[in-house]
Interface confidence: low
């Protein structure tokens, strides 16, 4: 027999299928030009000393073979003795180690069998009614195809699925979408309506994330407020990485999960911008304000569930940093300025009330005054901190107030609003005999004592109504009792108490008259 022809004789080896697991498989035959044909196959197992024979049986029942030697591809013409216009059955027999191994048969009409390509270009992936939709451009001159897909997850083997026949310039496939695991897909095509036509190779992997991006399991910690009024947010636990199927490991475009950090600064609501979204890798510095922090995971199908934390405000107070002067025209605050052209946000809220009731005011960018101080003034008519109660004041500063992560805390302190000197006057002053020359003076705590750091001291004044002599006794702000000694029996005294702040002298309480009775001996 000539090598270019199909030889209609018995092949030069015994006809016995070894039934071994190795051997030839995936036989594909198709027309490659007007008069030439090609068959190719794969061989599984050791290739040394293997000879391959392409077998062909015609519809008449006559059979022939081509000797391919060690090659796994063979070309022949329409003059090789194989009928190309009628159905033929082809298979490969491989003679190795004194045994014959056979491939599965393919039955086809060679003339109409065209080599089909898998989807070659960009495969677009989208979500459609809870399923995965893949779409691609039909390879040139190959409209009319059957399409199959196979898919696997990190823990499951390949499963085969059918996209059905396609007959358009674009082809598409609906595939199952997994809720919580990534999948690898491959697609293959074959000629539509051509009996026994060969499948193309599998396409490159298409890596698809789960419908729900994994919920970010992260933990944050926040450092203490530094001298610059900022504290670092640090990530204690990195988000878990998505497990990927084998073909998607390494570079797997499509399965990426991005984690974003959404900051919401709850304090200072009058500032221009309250939220900012950052990449999770870039951990920001925060002021001492209260924040809500959300970590949002998203993939190509959109955002998933987020995880939210509340970062409470840093309530470390600096009672000496803020000077407040109350005049007839209004009130002015002074504090050490941060730098040139700083915008300040002054926030205040009544102590003991819900954080949602904070009020704030934004200053225009200001430079320090000659004494290096920044100021904020308000008139009595504005009503700011006008009620006689304790307010918690926080001042934030930023050179770029539109950038949420550039705010810093200047100071936090307490302030008693309204007419503090009158409101702070101690009430319920009472005098009790203590000994023959002393009395105990008690009073109810001043309203100023509800305001940490505001009450500097109490002063108790005792006046001798006979001699008009006056003595004053300072009392610690935590005490509400003092003993006055060295008093004379039978003399009338008046006692008064006032509460002083660091910048305001209090108003005396109503005078309380008393005297120590003269003791008459029997």
């Amino acid at each position: 027999c000539r090598t270019s022809e199909c030889c209609f004789q018995d092949p030069p080896y015994p006809d016995a299928d070894s039934g071994s697991a190795s051997g030839p498989r995936d036989l594909r035959c198709y027309r490659i030009s007007s008069d030439r044909y090609e068959c190719s196959w794969q061989y599984e197992g050791p290739t040394a000393g293997v000879s391959h024979f392409l077998r062909c049986c015609l519809s008449s029942g006559r059979c022939c073979y081509f000797a391919a030697g060690s090659a796994t591809r063979l070309q022949f013409s329409d003059q090789a003795g194989v009928s190309v216009l009628y159905t033929v059955t082809l298979w490969v027999e491989s003679w190795a180690r004194n045994q014959t191994e056979k491939s599965p048969e393919v039955t086809l009409q060679l003339y109409n069998s065209v080599k089909y390509e898998p989807p070659l270009g960009d495969i677009k992936v989208s979500k459609l009614a809870g399923q995965l939709r893949m779409e691609w451009e039909t390879p040139d001159n190959q409209v009319g195809a059957e399409v199959q897909f196979r898919h696997r997850t990190p823990s499951s083997p390949w499963k085969l699925g059918d996209c059905g026949p396609q007959d358009d310039d674009t082809e598409s496939c609906l595939c199952p979408l997994e809720m919580n695991v990534a999948q690898e897909f491959q697609l293959r095509r074959r000629q539509l309506g051509s009996q026994g036509s060969s499948w193309s190779k599998w396409s490159s992997p298409v890596c698809v994330p789960p419908e729900n991006p994994p919920q970010p399991q992260v933990r944050f910690s926040v450092e203490q407020l530094g001298q610059d009024g900022r504290r670092r947010l640090t990530l204690k636990e990195q988000p878990t990485q998505l497990e990927l199927p084998e073909g998607c490991q390494g570079l797997a475009p499509g399965t990426e999960v991005t984690y974003r950090l959404q900051l919401h600064m709850l304090s200072c609501p009058c500032k221009a911008k309250a939220t900012r979204t950052l990449h999770l890798g870039k951990m920001p510095y925060l002021s001492g304000a209260a924040y809500n922090v959300a970590v949002i995971s998203s993939n190509q199908f959109g955002p998933g569930l987020n995880q939210t934390w509340h970062i409470p405000a840093d309530t470390h107070t600096e009672p000496v940093a803020l000077n407040i002067s109350v005049g007839t025209n209004g009130t002015t605050m002074y504090w050490p300025a941060r730098a040139q052209s700083m915008t300040y946000c002054i926030e205040w809220q009544p102590v003991g009330q819900d954080g949602g009731l904070a009020t704030c005011s934004l200053t225009a960018p200001q430079d320090p005054d000659p004494a290096g101080m920044a100021t904020y003034s308000w008139s009595r008519e504005s009503g700011a901190m006008g009620q006689e109660k304790c307010y918690y004041i926080t001042i934030f500063a930023s050179a770029h107030p539109e950038k949420l992560t550039l705010w810093s805390t200047v100071l936090s302190t307490y302030h008693f609003g309204g007419n503090a000197s009158a409101a702070g006057t101690p009430h319920h002053v009472s005098v009790k005999n203590h000994s023959l020359d002393s009395v105990s003076v008690d009073w109810a705590p001043s309203l100023l004592s509800t305001c940490p750091g505001v009450l500097k001291e109490y002063v108790v004044r005792c006046r001798d109504e006979d001699s008009k002599q006056v003595s004053e006794h300072p009392v610690q702000p935590t005490e509400t009792q003092v003993t006055l000694s060295g008093l004379r029996a039978g003399v009338a005294y008046t006692v008064q108490v006032r509460a002083d702040t660091a910048w305001l002298r209090g108003v005396w309480s109503q005078p309380q008259r008393f005297s120590i009775e003269v003791q008459v001996s029997d």
Epitope: L128, D162, C163, G164, P165, D167
Partner: nanobody
Framework: EVQLVESGGGLVQAGGSLRLSCAAS????????VAWSRQAPGSQRELVAS???????KYADSVKGRFTISRDNEKKMLYLQMDSLKPEDTAVYYC????????????WGQGTQVTVSS
């Protein structure tokens, strides 16, 4: 849930006409190919006509020139205009939708009976 509901079937004399309708819900209709198939008693189901998402049509040889398939993406409706009906067109007609242009589509309706009397 995907639902395909056929209507318009009935009894008609040979040479007459019928228009079948199919209302789709729960499916992104415009992205799917849609088709009509039929099954006569004792026979296998055969594809009658299909229309791709880009409005390319395909007909079985036995109905070419007599049947017309059309679709309305906005209303999510599929239609089959059947003219010059013959007794051999008697069958249950099913509406199908899915990603293919042939019989093995993803979803089928319950069917509507068409009877052509001579």
């Amino acid at each position: 849930e995907v639902q395909l509901v056929e209507s318009g079937g009935g009894l008609v004399q040979a040479g007459g006409s019928l228009r079948l309708s199919c209302a789709a819900s729960g499916i992104a209709f415009r992205y799917n190919s849609v088709a009509w198939s039929r099954q006569a008693p004792g026979s296998q189901r055969e594809l009658v006509a299909s229309i791709s998402n880009s409005a390319r049509t395909k007909y079985a040889d036995s109905v070419k020139g007599r049947f017309t398939i059309s679709r309305d993406n906005e209303k999510k409706m599929l239609y089959l205009q059947m003219d010059s009906l013959k007794p051999e067109d008697t069958a249950v007609y099913y509406c199908g939708a899915g990603r293919s242009m042939a019989g093995d589509v993803a979803y089928w309706g319950q069917g509507t009976q068409v009877t052509v009397s001579s």
